[in-house]
């Protein structure tokens, strides 16, 4: 039986496709003949699924590029608080139980994403090897204000959370060290592995296997959302916002953003992975009688989609005898 | 020439148990994941088990989950499913088959199994 | 579990017609997809994978296409060997799945 094959290194060339190189195995054995590359999808770490990225002023924003690691925080303008009402001085409120649970959130937060840009970039690899080249990310920590009160991590199971392996393929690459793999998912990391076969494959089976990670390039308009936008009336002045999810994004759907208004688009809502899971949408309340557009955008692990076409839709004032009584 | 040769099939009655197996040759058997698919009368393919090449990794689907179990010898080049529990409806034809780039490219022969009392 | 959606579940057709048939899964499954052909008392045999690449030795006049959730085996000129059950495949996430089949009769 030959021994491993040797340094191996994939990089992406485009979001679907991967190319892997090796080098043949130190001990060959024999006749080398082919080599056995698989490669299987990777699953996305539970604490994506799970944390609530409209919870939070900061959301991951992975600009894919050459290069190291950048994580950068950019901060809003500050707001200005009136504590001590319109008389008083500004001053710092001292922090509430729940803004000091945040914080320790916020920091766990911190240190799962972190983990996550160093787990699909700086990939594992076994011992003694070289380390793995391919294309990495610049990351940028982009802030915006979210009008959401919800909880910063669901306990509701996502179907695809529960997918904790999938389905491998396999392909005989004979007479060179070199294969391009195909028809792999935007953004998504994989695990591939290489054997390396001599004559006596049949009777005696080939090496044991060397393996590395890399992550496809994102899809160009692989986030935007198909489809059309469509709108129901609601009770109580509210409407509900209907739109199909990216059938192939650049590895999850993280969160949606709503931007919508009556003369100028200046309301915003976040909707995240889990609501629109649980609902198919989102409901947009305490809407002033009037005509309104609205436009939705994807956030997905790679960065933003782009807007939809506005979605155009009105809200009723009560009539008559319901206005006198209210 | 890649061959999977299938045996075990037969009559047995409900709640007993068979093992079926599917010998490999012609390939590198033991670096390569293999599955279990089977087709009952007159009906359609039903995916079963898969095993990963060193045997580590075993996913079933949900009607046999519990009952059967995928399992390999690759000193023997031999892949086996056992059957425990057996019921009227887990009659069919079962075949082995390879894995490749995007499906299964070589499949046993197929072996009828018979759940009959 | 993905379902997948096979029609029509019988087709009659001449030799030298062009046939058409479908796929459409539950969910999308970006292009994860197998045709197989089976002949009555013989395992399947892979025809396309990938949703639309041909298993090396497959004559040409079989092509596949789509990607997500739709998906289309086209015989472009049906031949007298081509009579036979085909059946689509999703390889997306276990359990595999398999549509429920399309048998083709000669007219």
């Known amino acids: 039986v030959p021994s491993i094959p040797l340094d191996v290194l994939s990089a992406s060339n485009s979001s679907s496709q991967l190319i892997v190189k090796w080098n043949p195995p130190s001990l060959p054995n024999g006749n080398l003949s082919y080599y056995i590359v698989r490669w299987q999808r990777q699953p996305q770490d539970g604490y994506l699924y799970r944390h609530n990225y409209c919870s939070k002023d900061k959301i991951p924003i992975r600009k894919y590029a050459d290069g190291t690691i950048d994580i950068e925080e950019v901060t809003e303008n500050p707001k200005t608080e009136v504590c001590g009402g319109e008389k008083g001085p500004c001053c710092a409120c001292p922090k509430t139980e729940a803004e000091k649970q945040a914080e320790k959130e916020e920091a766990e937060y911190r240190k799962v994403f972190e983990n996550f840009l160093h787990n699909s970039i700086f990939v594992p690899r076994p011992e003694r090897k070289r380390r793995d080249v391919m294309q990495v990310a610049n990351t940028t920590m982009s802030s915006r204000s979210r009008n959401t009160t919800a909880a910063d991590t669901y306990n509701i199971t996502d179907p695809e959370e529960l997918e904790t392996e999938y389905p491998f393929f396999e392909s005989r690459v004979d007479n060179k060290e070199r294969t391009v793999i195909s028809n792999l998912r935007p953004f998504t990391l994989y695990r591939i592995d290489i054997h390396s076969c001599n004559h006596e494959a049949e009777k005696l089976g080939c090496s044991a296997s060397n393996f590395v990670f890399a992550r496809t390039m994102p899809a160009e308009g692989a986030d935007d959302i198909p489809g059309p936008v469509t709108w129901e009336p609601r009770p109580e002045n509210s409407i509900f916002l209907k739109w199909p999810e990216p059938e192939n994004p650049n590895g999850l759907i993280l969160m949606y953003e709503i931007k919508y208004g009556s003369q100028v688009e200046d309301q915003r809502e976040c909707v995240s992975r889990q609501e629109y899971r649980k609902y198919g949408g989102a409901k947009l309340n305490r809407l002033n009688p009037g005509n309104y557009t609205a436009r939705i955008q994807a956030t997905s692990l790679s960065g933003n989609g782009s807007w939809t076409d506005p979605v155009f839709f009105y809200v009723q004032a009560k009539t008559g005898y319901e206005n006198f009584i209210h | 020439e890649v061959q999977l040769v299938q045996s075990g099939g037969g009559v047995v009655q409900p709640g007993t148990s068979l093992r079926l197996s599917c010998a490999a040759s012609?390939?590198?058997?033991?670096?390569?994941?293999m599955h279990w698919v089977r087709q009952a009368p007159g009906k359609g393919l039903e995916w079963v088990a898969v095993?990963?090449?060193?045997?580590?990794?075993?996913y079933y689907a949900d009607s046999v989950k519990g009952r059967f179990t995928i399992s390999r010898d690759n000193s023997k080049n031999t892949l086996y499913l056992q059957m425990n529990s057996l019921r009227a409806e887990d009659t069919a034809v079962y075949y082995c088959?390879?894995?490749?780039?995007?499906?299964?490219?070589?499949w046993g022969q197929g072996t009828l199994v018979t759940v009959s009392s | 579990d993905i379902q997948l959606t096979q029609s029509p579940s019988f087709l009659s057709a001449s030799v030298g017609d062009r046939v058409t048939i479908t796929c459409r899964a539950s969910?999308?499954?970006?292009?994860?997809l197998a045709w197989y052909q089976q002949k009555p008392g013989k395992a399947p045999k892979l025809l396309i994978y990938a949703a639309s690449t041909l298993q090396s030795g497959v004559p040409s006049r079989f092509s596949g296409s789509g990607s997500g959730t739709e998906f289309t085996l086209t015989i472009s000129s049906l031949q007298p060997e081509d009579f036979a059950t085909y059946y689509c495949?999703?390889?997306?996430?276990?359990?595999?799945?398999f549509g429920g089949g399309t048998k083709v009769e000669i007219k």
């Open positions: 012609g390939f590198s058997f033991r670096s390569h994941g």
């Open positions: 088959a390879t894995i490749g780039p995007g499906g299964f490219d070589y």
């Open positions: 495949q999703q390889l997306n996430s276990y359990p595999l799945t």
């Open positions: 969910q999308g499954i970006s292009s994860y």
């Open positions: 095993i990963s090449y060193d045997g580590s990794n075993k």
